[in-house]
């Protein structure tokens, strides 16, 4: 039975031009992490394996930092960065967590953070 | 010992499909790409596509974007390549290969299939 | 798409002589967060599939005799074979991986003078 749940940042803007960060946490679950996967809409961003390290997706390797931790920098953002991406957790012996954040990239320099929110 | 075993030559004709399979031994199989390359008769070496099993992530040439599907079979460790509308210019031997692209072994295309001769003549 | 260009396209080479292949990359292939070079580069014999040499640049792969090393950086490389051997006689492909599509150069055919 699948126990954990993923806490993540939720919805978030930024300015254009500017950096975010995309974190995950994954509690109330002893199940080791075995990988996570990073995707915007269906398109690799990045996989942190646990045994072999980070891989950056060649279309995005001068726009994308690993970490901190297993969480993920987007740097020079533009406002094509907004919308849904997923942190995808694979987990052994649970299975498969999903935690999704809204990223708006907004062209003043309003940018709020959202609230943090857990998907089950 | 890393081992990727391909499936036999196929002769087709021009308009028709072909499947190839690579079965893969040796190492955890939705860790790494797998790569698909071609080589025409005395030619060069030519990039397809490749999928990553561990999210069925794929990536296609866009020479061959709308012919080609790439898949994978965690359950038996095979990935496929399926290329359609053949031609004549498509006889070449495809040949599968495991992709690490880590950040940190970054080891590129490191174990080869044997290959797999497809002829494509009316 | 990256283009990767070969030189020679064929090399003669006495037993026990240097040989030297050149690779140049339209665009440079170093990824600054780790400061490697994606490229790599492939043995093939008739008959037989390609074989990895070196890896980022001047890695030899397991198993690969060190009379093979490769250097450069940014958009031009090199792969020298030391003292070359009659088992070294081959086709040598330089390949990037920095982006996709990963494209291969057009190859080096390396025999005995």
């Known amino acids: 039975m699948m126990t954990g749940t993923i806490e993540t940042t939720g919805n978030i803007s930024a300015e254009k031009g500017g950096s975010i960060i995309l974190q995950c946490h994954l509690s109330s679950t002893t199940a080791q992490v075995t990988q996570v996967n990073w995707e915007q809409q269906d398109q690799l961003l990045a996989i942190c394996n646990a045994d072999l390290g980070w891989h950056i997706s060649p279309s995005f390797k001068d726009r994308v930092a690993p970490g901190p931790g297993l969480g993920l920098t987007l740097q020079s953002l533009t406002v094509n960065d907004t919308g849904e991406y997923f942190c995808i957790y694979h987990t052994y012996p649970d299975g498969t967590y999903t935690g999704r954040i809204f990223l708006e990239v907004l062209e003043s320099s309003v940018a709020e953070h959202g609230a943090r929110f857990q998907i089950p | 010992e890393v081992q990727l075993v391909q499936s036999g030559a196929e002769v087709k004709k021009p308009g028709s499909s072909v499947k190839v399979s690579c079965k893969a031994s040796g190492y955890t199989f939705s860790n790494y790409w797998i790569g698909w390359v071609r080589q025409a008769p005395g030619q060069g070496l030519e990039w397809i596509g490749d999928i990553y099993p561990g999210g069925a992530y794929t990536n296609y040439n866009e020479k061959f974007k709308d012919r080609v599907t790439i898949t994978a079979d965690k359950s038996t460790s095979t990935a496929y390549m399926e290329l359609s509308s053949l031609r004549s210019e498509d006889t070449a031997v495809y040949y599968c290969?495991?992709?690490?692209?880590?950040?940190?072994?970054?080891?590129?295309?490191?174990?080869w299939g044997q290959g797999t001769l497809v002829t494509v003549s009316s | 798409d990256i283009v990767m260009t070969q030189s020679p396209d064929s090399l003669a080479v006495s037993l026990g002589e240097r040989a030297t292949i050149n690779c140049k990359s339209s665009?440079?292939?170093?990824?600054?967060?780790?400061?490697?070079?994606?490229l790599a580069w492939y043995q093939q014999k008739p008959g037989q599939p390609p074989k990895l040499l070196i890896y980022?640049?001047?890695t030899r792969e397991s198993g690969v005799p060190d009379r093979f090393s490769g250097s450069g950086s940014g958009t031009d490389f090199t792969l020298t074979i030391s003292s070359l051997q009659a088992e070294d006689v081959a086709v040598y492909y330089c390949q990037q991986y920095y982006s996709y599509p990963y494209t291969f150069g057009g190859g080096t055919k390396v025999e005995i003078k």
């Open positions: 665009q440079s292939l170093l990824y600054s967060r780790n400061q490697m070079n994606y």
């Open positions: 980022w640049t001047s």
């Open positions: 290969a495991r992709g690490d692209y880590y950040d940190s072994s970054g080891r590129a295309m490191d174990y």
